[in-house]
Amino acid sequence: MMTGTIETTGNISAEKGGSIILQCHLSSTTAQVTQVNWEQQDQLLAICNADLGWHISPSFKDRVAPGPGLGLTLQSLTVNDTGEYFCIYHTYPDGTYTGRIFLEVLESSVAEHGARFQIP
């Protein structure tokens, strides 16, 4: 039975040209995390494998940095970066836990963080 929950940074906004940290945290489970995938539109941005560590997809090496922790930092943001991002925790024996973050990249300086929320 999957007992864990993922807490994420929820709906967030940031300024064009700036950077943002995407964060997820898995709690309430003793399952072993084998790999965390960060994805946007079904495309892998980065993976963090328990044995091999962090890897940034070759397509995103210039603008994506690992961490902090199991989070992901997006740099040099453009309006095209607006959209859904997913942290996918592959665990044993529970299976897969998915967290969703919606990022809005704004032209002006009115960017502010949304509330945190949980996905069961």
Epitope: D42, Q43, L44, N49, L52, H55, P58
Partner: antibody
Amino acid sequence: QVQLVQSGAEVKKPGASVKVSCKASGYTFTSYYIHWVRQAPGQGLEWMGIINPSGGRTSYAQMFQGRVTLTRDTSTNTVYMELSSLRSEDTAVFYCAKDREEQWPVGGFDYWGQGTLVTVSS
Amino acid sequence: DIQMTQSPSSLSASVGDRVTITCRASQNIRRYLNWYQQKPGKAPELLIYSASNLQNGVPSRFSGSGSGTDFTLTISSLQPEDFATYYCQQSYIIPPTFGQGTKVEIR
């Protein structure tokens, strides 16, 4: 051109260990992961493990955990696969394979060694 | 681990036939699916990566499609050198797992 050249066939007794080498050439050795794949006679392909030639970090398939060890020698651009506690079911061809994408461990295997037949028999 | 299931396990076809092999993943692997060809006594060769991208040097009669859990390898017009065993492989998470193979034989 890219080449992965493996060591020759081996015959081993049950309980023994075998060490197979895979010498890489034609590309930057430390930039691409190397995988090992086992194929028993008439059977399919079975992933065994992976090594990062740059830092030496490894990951192994659960069924080989504790029995397989991957190492590398950056001075000779060679990766080694050692399998211990051999049993007759380990009789197989062992392949090394290079990952397609630089510093990305899951890009597909674009170059393969010629294979090394390991026969385990008493 | 992600299970990969190929069908059929074998098929008989003639030169010039259109051949389709399917591969199903036990969970969503997006488009992280590769296809390999293996001839007897030889190492496998990468045909297609990321579901539909043809590896350099691979003839255009080979094509791949699909996303999520269901994928297809198509040979538009089977040639004598295409009689071989074909494997799918997911490259979404480690360990990268293979299908059991599909043997394409001469009818």
